[in-house]
Structure formats: structure tokens, C-alpha cells
């Protein structure tokens, strides 16, 4: 009815789009909620974050397990009072993902 | 002054976060602007899209060249008038990216 090879290609495509940890570029300052007078060089780091598709539109690809990776970055404060400092920055790294439904907010929260 | 090895690691991290085409999961129906009574199986495909960091906050990682990839998918229209049809779907695939300044919208547009 449908060509078996085509179906195989489609299935492989589907497997690759599934919700899973994917290498993502994350902006450190916004990730850490730092004030605008603190910035980092480089401003971004590579970590794994959950992404991809779920087979129901109402489900969301969410992290089920997380590790924290330490990245060495230059922290620069403005106005420059001292030389840029090399600091270890801990960034969340998603190690497990799952398509999950949303839970209603508590009506009184 | 700074350990050469550490600087090398930081530089490599920075290179990897640079604005470039990255494999991304794209929802086909919303990509094509289809109505909610047309959907695809699988609902998502893998293509390359521009992503990553720019070294100035005012710049945006944007595509400078695009190709169109044809993906074989099942198109399902509701109400179901026929069996799901295998159709070639053309999806934009970013082949070149650049950090570009945002163009201000015309105040009267």
C-alpha cells in the first residue's frame, strides 16, 4: 500500500524529532538572572536542553532529570573596578526528557 | 596571567556557541500556516535553522541563505475524505547564518 522504504525513512525522521536532550546555546546572564551590569565572556555556553516533538499537541517536552555543569567564564562588572575574573558558572544540563501534560494552576495562587 | 589551557577551553566553547545553522525540530503545520483541520504524521521534521549567540546584544542570528528540503509526510485532512496521503512537503533549511542588526519597523507600518 505504501512503499516500505518510504515508511522507514518517515519513521527514522520521527525518531529524530522525538523529545530528547539536545545541544543548545544558552545565554549565561539571563540564565542566572544577573543584573544588566554584569556580563560574561563568552556570553553563551553549550548545554543540553529538552527539545523536540510530542505526539499530542497539548503535551510539552520537559526535563525529568538535570545535572549541573560547571563552565569557566570571565565575569565582567560595569563599571570596571577590577580586571575580568575567571569564575566557575554552574548551568543546568538536561539529562532526561519526557512529554508531559500541563497541570492546572491552583486557582488561589 | 590566565592559564593557557583554560583560555583554550573557553575559546572552543565560544566557537561552538556562535551563530550557525543548527539541527532543529520544526512543527510542519505551523511552519506551513495550515489550518487546524490539516495535520501531518509525523507532526515534526528535522531541518537546519540559524541559532546561537552574537557578541553584541543588539545583533540577531539570522539566515543569509536558505535551501528548501522536501520531506515525505502523511497529510491528514479532517473531515477525512480519503486515506491519509503521502505528500512531499517543502521545508526551509538555513544554509548560512550571520549576526545582523535588527531593522527597526517603520513607525507607520
Amino acid at each position: 500500500f505504501y512503499d516500505i522504504e518510504t515508511l522507514k525513512v518517515i519513521d527514522e525522521e520521527w525518531q529524530r524529532t522525538q523529545c530528547s536532550p539536545r545541544e543548545t546555546c544558552v545565554e549565561v546572564a539571563s540564565e542566572l538572572g544577573k543584573s544588566t551590569n554584569t556580563f560574561f565572556k563568552p556570553p553563551c555556553v553549550n548545554v543540553f536542553r529538552c527539545g523536540g516533538c510530542c505526539n499530542e499537541e497539548s503535551l510539552i517536552c520537559m526535563n525529568t532529570s538535570t545535572s549541573y555543569i560547571s563552565k569557566q567564564l570571565f565575569e565582567i562588572s560595569v563599571p570596571l573596578t577590577s580586571v575580568p575574573e575567571l569564575v566557575p558558572v554552574k548551568v543546568a544540563n538536561h539529562t532526561g526528557c519526557k512529554c508531559l501534560p500541563t497541570v492546572p494552576r491552583h486557582p488561589y495562587s | 596571567f590566565y592559564d593557557i589551557e583554560t583560555l583554550k577551553v573557553i575559546d572552543e566553547e565560544w566557537q561552538r556557541t556562535q551563530c550557525s545553522p543548527r539541527e532543529t525540530c520544526v512543527e510542519v503545520a505551523s511552519e506551513l500556516g495550515k489550518s487546524t483541520n490539516t495535520f501531518f504524521k509525523p507532526p515534526c521534521v528535522n531541518v537546519f535553522r540559524c541559532g546561537g549567540c552574537c557578541n553584541e546584544e543588539s545583533l540577531i542570528c539570522m539566515n543569509t541563505s536558505t535551501s528548501y528540503i522536501s520531506k515525505q509526510l502523511f497529510e491528514i485532512s479532517v473531515p477525512l475524505t480519503s486515506v491519509p496521503e503521502l505528500v512531499p512537503v517543502k521545508v526551509a533549511n538555513h544554509t548560512g547564518c550571520k549576526c545582523l542588526p535588527t531593522v527597526p519597523r517603520h513607525p507607520y507600518s
Epitope: 520521527w14 522525538q18 505526539n55 499530542e56 499537541e57 497539548s58 510539552i60 519526557k98 512529554c99 501534560p101 500541563t102 497541570v103 492546572p104 494552576r105 486557582p107 | 487546524t36 495535520f39 504524521k41 509525523p42 507532526p43
Partner: antibody, heavy 117, light 112 residues
Framework: EVQLQQSGPELVKPGASVKMSCKAS????????MHWVKQSHGRSLEWIGY????????YYNQKFRDKATLTVDKSSSTAYMQLNSLTSEDSALYYC??????????WGQGTSVTVSS | DIVMTQTPLSLPVSLGDQASISCRSS???????????LHWYLQKPGQSPKLLIY???NRFSGVPDRFSGSGSGTDFTLKISRVEAEDLGVYFC?????????FGGGTKLEIN
């Protein structure tokens, strides 16, 4: 044509358990979640939970977490629901339902469970 | 849990009349993705429920155009423009935005 064929009626004793089946055909079994719903007194519908046949991931309504266990057999495109420690409260009609991308779209014919001593 | 309240409980109509069923949710059904997962099902006597309308206003496969859905947020309506004998049964609204998925108590459409 999408079809969900459920197993026949069950008459069981209180405290026992029951395992019902739902055989899917007419579509790619692993591409769609399978939900289960309980209908009692011919009217009230309660959602039990769902299973993703692709990877076996399950999600249960808190109320049924200790009552129901959802499983699948991919080779036969069949979903199963086991109910344990049955009481008269569990007497009802149980449906398996395929979840389309937007909504639960196709329902099985239902499996009737009667708990009686 | 989100409570779905349907009115009326019973709706006697004459064939050819318009019928209107209301469904109210205890919380907004707007998902964080912007969609509203409010669906309508019809259960005819001795049968399993069948999907009629999905995502507020989209008719499912094979559903006649005399059926229409509308509403937003917490208030939704199913309308049947000209009731036919085959439309009789119990109508349920259901929300698929949050877990647990919940259903309305049903509205029985019967002949006057």
C-alpha cells in the same frame, strides 16, 4: 480505518484483579498515545491515564495510580489495562481511546467489568 | 481538578429545531501554547462516545455541518442547527488542556 477492539465482559470477585485488552488496527500503533476512561452509571466519564506505545511512558490520574496499570505489546499492537484490588466501585465500562494530535479521537467499544461476590 | 459543568442536564427538542448546549470550566482552558483543548463528544444509546468537535470549533471527520462549536476561556457552546433523529443521545464536553483530563456530566438530547 482506525479500529480499537476491546476484550469481552468480565465478572470478577472483590479483591481480585482483571486485565483487559485493546487491539489497535488501521494506523501506526506506536505513533499515537492510548488513553483509558471509566464510565459508570451510564453517564459519568473519568480519565484514568495514558500510555505512549513508542516508549512505554505512562501518565496516570492520581485517583487511579494505585488501581490501574497500563502496558502495551508493540508486536501485536495491543494495549492492556490491569485493575487490581477490585471493589464494587470498580464496576463500570472501560474504554481505550486513541489520542490524535489534537484530541482523543477514536474509542473502543468498551469492556464491561462487574465486581460481585 | 478542572470541573466541567454542562447545562442543561436534559434537552427536549422537536426534530428540525435548533439545540444549544453550554459547557463551563472552573478554570481557563487556554494552554500555554495558546490553543484551547475543549472537545465535544456524542454517545448514542448502546454505543461508545464519538468525537464531534475538537479544539472548540473544528468538526471532526464525517461530522455534518449542522454541528458547530464556539466559545473561549471558560465558556463554550455546542449548537445543532436543525436536529435530526440520528443526533439523539448524550453530549459530553471534555477538556484536554490539563491533567487530569475531565468531562462534563453530559446533556441528554431527546425528542419532545
Amino acid at each position: 480505518e482506525v479500529q480499537l477492539q476491546q476484550s469481552g465482559p468480565e465478572l470478577v470477585k472483590p479483591g481480585a484483579s482483571v486485565k483487559m485488552s485493546c487491539k489497535a488496527s488501521g494506523y501506526s500503533f506506536t505513533g499515537y498515545n492510548m488513553h483509558w476512561v471509566k464510565q459508570s452509571h451510564g453517564r459519568s466519564l473519568e480519565w484514568i491515564g495514558y500510555i505512549d506505545p513508542y516508549n512505554g511512558d505512562t501518565y496516570y490520574n492520581q485517583k487511579f495510580r494505585d488501581k490501574a496499570t497500563l502496558t502495551v505489546d508493540k508486536s501485536s499492537s495491543t494495549a492492556y489495562m490491569q485493575l487490581n484490588s477490585l471493589t464494587s466501585e470498580d464496576s463500570a465500562l472501560y474504554y481505550c481511546i486513541r489520542a490524535g494530535y489534537y484530541a482523543m479521537d477514536y474509542w473502543g467499544q468498551g469492556t464491561s467489568v462487574t465486581v460481585s461476590s | 481538578d478542572i470541573v466541567m459543568t454542562q447545562t442543561p442536564l436534559s434537552l427536549p427538542v422537536s426534530l428540525g429545531d435548533q439545540a444549544s448546549i453550554s459547557c463551563r470550566s472552573s478554570q481557563s482552558l487556554v494552554h500555554i501554547n495558546g490553543n484551547t483543548y475543549l472537545h465535544w463528544y456524542l454517545q448514542k444509546p448502546g454505543q461508545s462516545p464519538k468525537l464531534l468537535i475538537y479544539k472548540v470549533s473544528n468538526r471532526f471527520s464525517g461530522v455534518p455541518d449542522r454541528f458547530s462549536g464556539s466559545g473561549s476561556g471558560t465558556d463554550f457552546t455546542l449548537k445543532i442547527s436543525r436536529v435530526e433523529a440520528e443526533d439523539l443521545g448524550v453530549y459530553f464536553c471534555s477538556q484536554g488542556t490539563h491533567v487530569p483530563r475531565t468531562f462534563g456530566g453530559g446533556t441528554k438530547l431527546e425528542i419532545n
